[in-house]
């Protein structure tokens, strides 16, 4: 008994395709070893047609593939364009010849079925319309016209001239004649079902003078789409249903035992599992739509099936398009945490990843919202202003060339939780979904600046502390000048060499800023936080006013912000650091400048891809002027 | 509501033939896939046949221990499908089980590969 299985009787009809399933034991050998599709010659011989090891004889040639999944220990051999010299005995098997493990298959391609000479044949899709043209001669322009569909006995009238209309075809079936045409008249049958596939006759006038024609009606159901996907990257389901449903509520739905579970329509229905990953998208008039997922699950694969009804629901009848979608395990996506925890007023920093082969590319954050059809308006981007509500909060740093950049945000609110997308103008199979959660803060922040209302006086020096625990003793301490293209790190130097120290005092770890002399360009945010490598990790925000010396003058706090600016107890682990390069302004900051919106997310590669450094940096900071002392007591 | 239902099954003599069939009702779409599994008492449920419908090829499978004594049949469009069974003998005793689908993804072989399931009609050899 051969440990290979699969179809054993195989039928076609010419100018069709098959696709042969071959199942194969579940072992590393198998999973890495040569399939091949071989047809046996009478003298037991069998003779390579297509193998895994990229082979394809002449008469396969531009016709036939042979993919293997081995996530699903199949391979499958897609075979169009038959004809009946296909027919024959073949074998589907695995191992370096053709005389390893193998199972026989017999493939039988028929001639498309004979009908009626003047049989006009019509293939239509599940759901679609079909109009029949029906000619007849003059002298049967008074006579009754009339369709009827042949069962085993009879034929079943469908329409007439006489407005009779059989039961199942009410409201579907219209017989019409065309302006002064008087030699032809039309049945149109909408929302095709199985039921209606068949023979049909056209007649008019009645007895052996009549006008008849053999129709054959073909109602196909659309053949799935098959989409291989890996494990947390995102999928695009691109819906094309037709002008006729253009005006019609749109799904995707998902087969289930004994209905398809909609995902998501556009009447503001979601199902919670894509809660955070989902978003359906009108493209155009022309009925079409798409539906993106991200962050794929293994749980997310199966059969998903897209269509259009007043109900927003699968209707019979109803134009569909389905695929089958499955997740490959083996994911050349990282594995990161899919919830990151923060707290109030605290800070977490996000680890995106992007495919390492387009470190060029633009990256974006964004802040997934459900509401109406599901949308992402872009907050930060690599060449995209922050949003104006996270000014001084929010900040993007790329590190081209190793996979990942990281967001961070901080001054944290309960408001900030949610879901929040990385994605890129790139490979958009590297969209991932992060779900931020924010719990009211129960203990003092990590990171501490002083003094809190900080207003430093032109020309002066100021100095600014930031406070933090021994647990990020050996970590490096930064300070960095925020401005809506991101955060540019201070340059730094320590006041003398580390020494190794056995006890840490809690009390007296600082790094401290200082502006010397302060300048106007010094007023705005700046941010404490500790990083190691590329590792971001906490963050701590404070606004400093920049104001002229006035007699008796007394520092007014410019915001209450700074009194927030207080640090998440976890942080996200990341690999990435700062681009120091200073960024020029960008005038026309895309791919979301207008709305700042992911509305078209498929249709990514059109955008304006603006010039300029990724990595933020303020043209304005003066660093000479900007000394960054670590002082350790 | 989805129903498969089974018929034919019957006592019969070793090396005669049976027909079963299996009509499935309630559904809105055609199915793609439709098999029979049998149980003979105290074992697991096994394979029998299947056949697979795609646009208008057809896919029959069938376990070593049938090939060439059953066969398979259907239409997909009326959602119905035989079992033509030949040269029966004591071993091919049980419960004959109607599975079906509506698309053709997974091992044919595994009973989690269909969604619908019949009652099962029982087919009794006799020496």
């Known amino acids: 008994k051969s440990p290979i299985f699969g179809p054993q009787e195989v039928s076609s009809i010419e100018g069709d395709s098959v696709s042969i399933t071959c199942y194969y034991p579940d072992t590393s050998v198998n999973r890495h070893t040569r399939k091949y599709w071989c047809r046996q010659g009478a003298s037991g011989m069998c003779t390579t047609l297509i193998s895994s090891n990229g082979y394809l004889s002449k008469e396969y040639s531009g016709r036939a593939n042979l993919i293997n999944f081995p996530e699903n220990n199949t391979f499958v051999i897609n075979i169009e364009q038959l004809t009946q010299d296909d027919t024959g005995s073949y074998k589907c098997g695995l191992g370096t010849s053709n005389r390893g493990l193998s199972f026989d298959v017999s493939l039988e391609v028929s001639q498309v079925p004979e009908l009626p000479s003047d049989t006009h044949v019509y293939t239509k899709d599940i759901g679609r319309n079909v109009t029949i043209e029906c000619p007849f001669k003059r002298e049967n322009a008074p006579s009754k016209k009339s369709l009827c569909k042949k069962t085993n006995q009879s034929c079943e009238l469908v329409i007439d001239s006489t407005e009779k209309v059989n039961p199942s075809y009410i409201g579907r079936a219209k017989l019409f004649m065309k302006g002064t045409d008087l030699t032809v008249f039309y049945v149109n049958i909408s929302h095709l079902t199985h039921n209606d596939a068949g023979l049909y006759i056209c007649q008019a006038g009645e007895g052996p003078s009549a006008d008849k024609k053999n129709v054959d009606l073909q109602v196909l159901a659309p053949e799935p789409e098959l989409l291989y996907k890996d494990l947390r990257s995102s999928v695009t389901f691109e819906c094309d249903l037709g002008r006729e449903v253009a005006n019609e509520a749109k799904y995707l739905c998902r087969m289930n035992k004994e209905t398809c579970d909609v995902i998501i329509n556009t009447l503001g229905k979601r199902d919670p599992d894509f809660e955070g990953r989902i978003l359906i998208t009108p493209k155009d008039d022309n009925g079409r739509f798409s539906v993106l997922i991200t962050g794929l699950r293994k749980e997310d694969a199966g059969h998903y099936q897209c269509g259009a009804h007043s109900s927003g629901l699968p209707q019979e009848g109803w134009p569909i398009q389905t695929w089958q979608l499955f997740v490959n395990e083996e994911s050349t996506i990282p594995n990161r945490r899919s919830v990151v925890k923060g707290v109030t007023g605290g800070s977490v920093a996000i680890a995106c990843p992007y495919n390492p082969k387009e470190s060029s590319s633009l990256k974006y954050w964004c802040r997934w919202e459900g509401d109406g059809n599901g949308h992402c308006p872009v907050l930060v981007g690599t060449q995209a202003q922050v949003q104006e509500e996270y000014e001084g909060r929010l900040a993007l740093f790329d590190q081209p060339g190793n996979g990942t950049y990281t967001v961070i945000l901080n001054q944290l609110t309960t408001e900030d939780a949610g879901f929040y997308w990385c994605l890129t103008n790139g490979d958009s199979r590297w969209r991932t979904t992060i779900e931020l959660q924010v719990a009211e803060a129960t203990r003092e922040p990590n990171l501490e600046v002083t003094p809190q209302n900080a207003t430093a006086v032109l020309g002066e020096t100021f100095t600014v502390s930031c406070h933090y625990p021994c647990k990020f003793y050996s970590q490096e301490k930064y300070w960095c000048k925020w401005s809506n293209k991101g955060c540019h790190i201070l340059p730094s130097h320590d006041e003398g060499a580390r020494q190794s120290s056995v006890s840490c005092d809690q009390s007296s770890q600082l790094v401290s800023m200082t502006l010397n002399p302060v300048s106007k360009e010094d007023e705005g945010w700046y941010w404490c936080g500790v990083k190691q490598g590329q590792t971001y990790g906490e963050t701590t925000a404070i606004y400093i006013a920049v104001e002229e010396r006035t007699r008796g003058s007394s520092h007014v706090n410019p915001t209450d912000a700074n009194a927030r600016a207080k640090v998440a107890l976890e942080e996200e682990v990341v690999d990435s650091s700062i681009s120091e390069k200073e960024n020029k302004a960008i005038p026309n900051p895309g791919p979301f400048a207008n709305e700042r919106e992911i509305q078209n997310v498929g249709d990514q590669a059109q955008e304006n891809r603006a010039s300029g450094d990724a990595g933020s940096a303020d043209g304005q900071s003066r660093s000479s002027s900007s000394k960054h002392h670590h002082h350790h007591h | 509501e989805v129903q498969l239902v089974e018929s034919g099954g019957g006592v019969v003599q070793a090396e005669d033939s049976l027909r079963l069939s299996c009509a499935a009702s309630g559904l809105s779409f055609s199915l793609s896939r439709m098999g029979w599994f049998r149980q003979a008492p105290g074992k697991e449920r096994e394979f029998v046949a299947t056949i697979e419908w795609s646009g208008r090829s057809t896919y029959k499978y069938y376990d070593d221990s049938v090939k060439g004594r059953f066969a398979v049949s259907g239409d997909n469009t009326k959602n119905t499908m035989n079992l033509q069974m030949k040269g029966l003998n004591l071993e091919d005793t049980g419960v004959y089980y109607c599975?079906?689908?509506?698309?053709?993804?997974?091992?044919?072989?595994?009973?989690?590969?269909?969604?619908?399931w019949g009652q099962g009609t029982q087919v009794t050899v006799s020496s």
């Open positions: 599975a079906a689908n509506p698309n053709n993804y997974g091992d044919p072989r595994t009973p989690g590969a269909y969604q619908y």
